[in-house]
């Protein structure tokens, strides 16, 4: 058993039919020594007498909120929260596995320059008695700070017969140098409480390769004279490391039928500019990536053709 | 990245186009590594982030774009000095603080170069004859040197009298092959940057 | 005690179907995950489908992907796999057993599939 | 389709200490926990070990687990008659997960 925040306990136990559980003793926050009764949740029901009391916890039934009286007054709660270990390996209800990049996936982060700000996300099917809190740092074992917000729900979608929730938060490295060289990853640390159920979940990376550039900026056409070409010119995203001499990106431009079927023309260029052939009801669109470190490419932006 | 790209014209700077086949050269060659080593701990997740030039250059600090030197963070350790006279220094103008960057570059390759030679050495001893080192990115290495030309002590390459371990040998090498992809991003980055200067 | 009584097998031709059940006692059904292994003769144990302890979740071999489906009625204590397009490559005994690093199996039950 | 590997049969004479190995890999032994079973012949398996090295109650002490890097074992010192059966290791993959992963399994012969 160990405190997660005052008066909040959780109960770590081997979860398996008939298993033993676990022996807690709660303490009653009190100087007083007689008199005292305890109970679990709006129950009325005595469960024991004493300063201390002792409770075999195997189920969600032993979880709860115990309560110590004196004489019909309060004098402390402990919460017990239970954390699931099945077959060695922690429970993972609360959350669904975004199964990208790769299975076993929960939390999924984006960073949209080298600053050391980051955006993380994950999805639950619960939609009530939810709460999450994020930490973060940089390293482990001698960690530095990043700093985190509350998380927040971010969108709502529905998923055949299931309501999906995604819930995000925003992180911010304390002192990051855009042109470090990482060598210690960003751990993210999710605490997920679902009713009385508590899980954890947690993300490894370095922001190199969670990087994803907002889509280029200011897309414009310009015909050349006497011919089906056109001049397509972008600027770098705002939102992107500067200077961009230093932070590079490298460009994606794509030529694409009205149809899904028909031949997707794509050049690849490192200017801001590129010259290509806009047939009749097509679109081009331009995304970015790091130069040099090949991470995810940006969305595309689009403009029609006409 | 295995698709087309309009190469740009290396213009004034001679050394953005070798930087540019470095990065290409330990790209591919940490991309066989984890291919072939597929059964040894040799992906990003999985390795040690180890940095054999800590302590004895800060490329990533001398390099510096001056518009980041205005970030406290950034502003570790820059009083490190190196030998000045490169070739790469496309003018007279060319400041103190650029020839402390590329010869800190210049220090970082030797030591690559050494590390890699001494590693190839006893990957060819090993009776599996899994991985070698590619040749390509070996002289690759030794062209932006000479393309940077500084001059510097020649480094002795490392000889071991022990019987090479190859698992932690292959390991070492993923090791490396990473921290040098890095670095590898870092000097393109500079080179770049020193072109459009 | 634990108990877990299985039912369901027999013999079908190819391309039939069948349904398995595996009747639990002696513990909360509901809030354990459910698996379901089976052993062709001779050969050795091979996993087929698990359950999450809501039925929320289902994870199958690609073997019986598309094919199996396991399903639980957590009011009525019992699981079940439902199998179809049943091939001669599916005969075995098939065993259901709880989720955890104490587990507990059913008697198993044969299923023979052919012509 | 099996990952773990075990060695087909081993035997010995009774007294004798017996070990079986049970071989994985980064993703599965290397990162998870290891169980192994017994199967006597027409039964369901039984549960000898869990968590690697741990013994459920009511398994002899002779019976005891090992795992080191991508690799398990399951020793038995002392073998007796009654232990001729099939074995059966067992542990998950970090990318399948609750997928069971069972070892090719080994027959055990008690000999004499």
């Known amino acids: 058993i160990w405190e997660l925040k005052k008066d909040v306990y959780v109960v770590e136990l081997d979860w398996y039919p008939d298993a033993p559980g676990e022996m807690v003793v709660l303490t009653c926050d009190t100087p007083e020594e007689d008199g005292i009764t305890w109970t679990l949740d709006q129950s009325s029901e005595v469960l024991g007498s004493g300063k201390t009391l002792t409770i075999q916890v195997k189920e969600f039934g032993d979880a709860g909120q115990y309560t110590c009286h004196k004489g019909g007054e309060v004098l402390s709660h402990s919460l017990l929260l239970l954390h699931k270990k099945e077959d060695g390996i922690w429970s993972t209800d609360i959350l669904k596995d975004q199964k990208e990049p790769k299975n076993k996936t929960f939390l999924r982060c984006e960073a949209k320059n080298y600053s050391g700000r980051f955006t993380c996300w994950w999805l639950t099917t619960i939609s009530t008695d939810l709460t999450f809190s994020v930490k973060s740092s940089r390293g482990s074992s001698d960690p530095q700070g990043v700093t985190c917000g509350a998380a927040t729900l971010s969108a709502e979608r529905v998923r055949g017969d299931n309501k999906e929730y995604e819930y995000s938060v925003e992180c911010q490295e304390d002192s990051a140098c855009p042109a470090a060289e990482e060598s210690l990853p960003i751990e993210v640390m999710v605490d997920a409480v679902h009713k009385l159920k508590y899980e954890n979940y947690t993300s490894s990376f370095f922001i190199r390769d969670i990087i994803k550039p907002d889509p280029p900026k200011n897309l414009q056409l310009k015909p050349l004279k006497n011919s089906r070409q056109v001049e397509v010119s972008w600027e770098y995203p705002d939102t992107w490391s500067t200077p961009h001499s230093y932070f590079s990106l490298t460009f994606c431009v794509q030529v694409q039928g009205k149809s899904k079927r028909e031949k997707k023309d794509r050049v690849f260029t490192d200017k801001t500019s590129a010259t290509v052939i806009c047939r009749k009801n097509a679109s081009i669109s331009v995304r970015a990536q790091d130069r040099y470190y090949s991470s995810s490419w940006s969305e595309w932006a689009s403009v029609p053709c006409s | 990245r295995n698709l087309p790209v309009a190469t740009p014209d290396p213009g004034m700077f001679p050394c953005l186009h070798h930087s540019q086949n470095l990065l290409r050269a330990v790209s591919n060659m940490l991309q066989k590594a984890r291919q072939t080593l597929e059964f040894y701990p040799c992906t990003s997740e999985e390795i040690d982030h180890e940095d054999i030039t800590k302590d004895k250059t800060s490329t990533v600090e001398a390099c510096l774009p001056l518009e980041l030197t205005k970030n406290e963070s950034c502003l570790n350790s820059r009083e490190t000095s190196f030998i000045t006279n490169g070739s790469c220094l496309a003018s007279r103008k060319t400041s103190f603080m650029m020839a402390l960057c590329l010869s800190s570059i210049y220090e970082d390759l030797k030591m690559y170069q050494v590390e890699f030679k001494t590693m190839n050495a006893k990957l060819l001893m090993d009776p599996k004859r899994q991985i070698f080192l590619d040749q390509n990115m070996l002289a690759v290495i030794d062209e932006l040197m000479q393309a940077l030309n500084f001059n510097s002590e020649t480094v002795p390459q490392k000889s071991s009298l022990e019987e090479p371990d190859f698992y932690k040998t292959k390991i070492k090498l993923c090791i490396l092959l990473h921290a040098f992809r890095i670095r590898a991003v870092t000097i393109d980055r500079v080179m770049s940057y020193l072109n459009a200067s | 005690q634990v108990q877990l009584v299985q039912s369901g097998g027999g013999v079908v031709q190819p391309g039939r179907s069948l349904r398995l059940s595996c009747a639990a006692s002696?513990?909360?059904?509901?809030?354990?995950?459910m698996h379901w292994v089976r052993q062709a003769p001779g050969k050795g144990l091979e996993w087929v489908a698990f359950?999450?302890?809501?039925?929320?979740?289902?994870y199958y071999a690609d073997s019986v992907k598309g094919r199996f489906t396991i399903s639980r009625d957590n009011s009525k204590n019992t699981l079940y796999l439902q199998m179809k397009s049943l091939r001669a490559e599916d005969t075995a005994v098939y065993y259901c057993?709880?989720?955890?690093?104490?587990?507990?199996w059913g008697q198993g039950t044969m299923v023979t599939v052919s012509s | 389709s099996y990952v773990l590997t075990q060695p087909p049969s081993v035997s010995g004479t009774p007294g004798q200490r017996v070990t079986i190995s049970c071989s994985g890999g980064?993703?599965?032994?290397?990162?998870?926990?290891v169980k192994w079973y017994q199967q006597l012949p027409g039964t369901a398996p039984k549960l000898l070990i869990y968590?690697?090295?741990q013994r459920p109650s009511g398994v002899p002490d002779r019976f005891s687990g090992s795992k080191s890097g991508t690799s398990a074992s399951l020793a038995i010192t002392g073998v007796q008659a009654e232990d001729e059966a099939d074995y059966y290791c067992?542990?998950?993959?970090?990318?399948?997960?609750?997928?069971?992963?069972f070892g090719t399994g080994t027959k055990v012969t008690v000999l004499g």
């Open positions: 057993k709880t989720h955890g690093s104490h587990d507990n």
């Open positions: 002696g513990f909360t059904f509901s809030s354990y995950g």
């Open positions: 359950i999450r302890y809501d039925g929320s979740n289902k």
């Open positions: 980064r993703s599965n032994i290397g990162s998870n926990q």
């Open positions: 968590g690697n090295d």
């Open positions: 067992q542990s998950y993959d970090r990318g399948t997960h609750p997928a069971l992963l």
